[in-house]
């Protein structure tokens, strides 16, 4: 554990001003596993001025970071890139003159406390004003910045020309496409400062490529996979002040596939279990020994679970006998195609 600090299996705290620390605390190899550290508390460290890009990355489990009454002046943009579990940050009473939202945009923070820092009034910190305005009143902090006259000014009163939130607009509000086909999405962004445009495609499986020029962007998705049905695609405009996004849900239409059909199992009823994928929802028809199976209250199809474009169910049979032994074929069809799958069922005798 670094000098002036104390360490436990989950916590590091550095509060002794003397001799103090000049760099962010790092654990010695073969000591405590940094991944298990959930809280770091630093106080009274006047010589701690910088958090570098790689200082915090080892603490992937970190939830609470507190640096108070210290000399923190600069935080590298990518300092918290690997710390996706961070929920609470407290940088009260440090020497921060600026702080970008780029530090925190990927984090799901519950608290970001920044009171008592000598921020410079500029567009760079306008995002903090916007953040304050979106918070409910009990959570707001008294934040100030120094104007050109070196006067303290409440951040709530900050007015900077040509410094506002951007906007993003997608051309396609809803997007329905057939599996295997391609589609191009267009997006336009605007704002001052001029925003950058990027696409958030989440875990899209289909091959995609984007082209961006200034305020226009296009995303081409090719050979669209049925696995991408229901996924959201967003066009994001981002500048110093904040971001705006416009989203579209992708609906992929595709022919049915019976991915699972098994021999009957007995529970409360007998059940021939199946799973069918398809969009739009496939119509199901059973055949028994090649002939149409006439469903009734004693033999009927039940869908138990619907998972977007996947349907899990049973052909439910009440008290089947040897008369029900034979080949059962499930046919699933929609306007994009069909599939059949057969099993042999032996109930008794």
């Amino acid at each position: 554990c670094p000098t002036s600090c104390k360490c436990s299996s989950a916590r590091i705290w550095c509060t002794e001003p003397s001799p103090g620390i000049v760099a962010f605390p790092r654990l010695e190899p073969n000591s405590v596993d940094p991944e298990n550290i959930t809280e770091i508390l630093i106080a009274n460290q006047k010589r701690l001025e910088i958090i570098n890009e790689d200082d915090v990355e080892a603490y992937v489990g970190l939830r609470n970071l507190t640096i108070v009454d210290s000399g923190l002046k600069f935080v590298a943009y990518k300092a918290f890139l690997k710390n996706s579990n961070l929920r609470h940050i407290n940088f009260t009473r440090n020497k921060l003159t600026s702080l970008s939202r780029r530090h925190f945009r990927h984090l799901d923070l519950s608290d970001l406390i920044l009171t008592g820092n000598p921020f410079t009034c500029s567009c760079d910190i306008m995002w903090l004003k916007t953040l304050q305005e979106t918070k409910s009143s009990p959570d707001t902090q008294d934040l100030y910045c120094l104007n050109e006259s070196s006067k303290n000014m409440p951040l709530a009163n900050l007015q900077i020309p040509n410094c506002g939130l951007p906007s993003a607009r997608l051309a396609a509000p809803n997007l329905t496409v057939e599996e295997g086909k391609s589609v191009t999405l267009s997006c336009s962004v605007g704002g001052d400062p001029l925003p950058t445009l990027y696409w958030d495609v989440g875990n899209l499986v289909s091959k995609h490529m984007n082209e961006t020029s200034h305020t226009q962007g296009s995303l081409r998705i090719t050979n669209i996979s049925s696995d991408d049905s229901g996924k959201q695609i967003s066009c994001v405009a981002e500048n110093l002040v904040g971001e705006d996004q416009d989203s579209v849900n992708l609906t992929v239409h595709f022919a049915p596939t019976i991915t699972f059909l098994e021999s009957p199992t007995s529970d409360h009823h007998w059940c021939i279990p199946f799973t069918v994928r398809g969009n739009p929802k496939p119509a199901l028809q059973w055949f028994y020994n090649g002939a149409i199976l006439n469903e009734s209250k004693y033999i009927c199809t039940k869908i138990h679970v619907t998972n977007h474009t996947e349907y899990h169910g049973c052909l439910q049979l009440d008290n089947p006998t040897h008369m029900n032994n034979g080949d059962y074929t499930l046919m699933a069809k929609n306007e994009y195609g069909k599939d059949e799958r057969q099993i042999s069922a032996h109930f008794m005798g």
Partner: antibody, heavy 119, light 112 residues
Framework: EVQLQQSGPELVKPGASVKISCKAS????????MNWVKQSHGKSLEWIGD????????SYNQKFKGKATLTVDKSSSTAYMELRSLTSEDSAVYYC????????????WGQGTTLTVSS | DIVMSQSPSSLAVSAGEKVTMSCKSS????????????LAWYQQKPGQSPKLLIY???TRESGVPDRFTGSGSGTDFTLTISSVQAEDLAVYYC????????FGSGTQLEIK
């Protein structure tokens, strides 16, 4: 022996309706879908629609929606197709055909019913 | 809608000769899971109803002579008659059953 026996030829006036029958024998009507197919003189075959005789569920070729209505009478093992608002374009031979192999293929066909629409 | 195109529209051959006719679909008729093609061939002799010859693109219907062979996959299919007989005079239609049902325009086979 499986047989599909269709009703005889029809001569009707434009604007009228007609109901063609198809009586199934040699098998249980409710075991197979019944399909209807149109063949205009010297032309190819066009699928009109099919019916599940168990529950009366139908599907139609979009072109024939509103023109054809398919029904069955299980007690007499007979399938019917009604054609309405007839025009000369409806003059053709109409076949019923049994849907086999999970209703993908038509293994038995009726002998055809000739419909002539003329004033 | 799936469009079925047949060629040639007609052909004339002598008895004993081999004949092939083609059927193309506007989209694939292949079920990628089962590897089955939803394609059939029908024979319609003059004044008669159509008769099922081949289903699943290559399975011969019972009672159909083995000189009739179906082949192909996806979008391109062929019906071959290895040694044409006089009684094979007919129109031959292909039909898809992957999305509803569509017939081709037919190939008229004449015997010289």
């Amino acid at each position: 022996e499986v047989q599909l026996q269709q009703s005889g030829p029809e001569l009707v006036k434009p604007g009228a309706s007609v109901k063609i029958s198809c009586k199934a024998s040699g098998y249980t009507l409710t075991d197979y879908y019944m399909n209807w197919v149109k063949q205009s003189h010297g032309k190819s075959l066009e699928w009109i629609g099919d019916i599940n005789p168990n529950n009366g569920g139908t599907s139609y070729n979009q072109k024939f929606k509103g023109k054809a209505t398919l029904t069955v009478d299980k007690s007499s093992s007979t399938a019917y197709m009604e054609l309405r608002s007839l025009t000369s374009e409806d003059s053709a031979v109409y076949y019923c055909a049994r849907g086999a192999y999970y209703s993908n293929y038509f293994d038995y066909w009726g002998q055809g019913t000739t419909l002539t629409v003329s004033s | 809608d799936i469009v079925m195109s047949q060629s040639p529209s007609s052909l004339a051959v002598s008895a004993g000769e081999k004949v092939t006719m083609s059927c193309k679909s506007s989209q694939s008729l292949l079920n990628s899971r089962t590897r089955k093609n939803y394609l059939a061939w029908y024979q319609q002799k003059p004044g008669q109803s159509p008769k099922l010859l081949i289903y699943w693109a290559s399975t011969r219907e019972s009672g159909v002579p083995d000189r009739f062979t179906g082949s192909g996959s996806g979008t391109d299919f062929t019906l071959t008659i290895s040694s044409v007989q006089a009684e094979d005079l007919a129109v031959y239609y292909c039909k898809q059953s992957y999305i509803l049902f569509t017939f081709g325009s037919g190939t008229q086979l004449e015997i010289k």
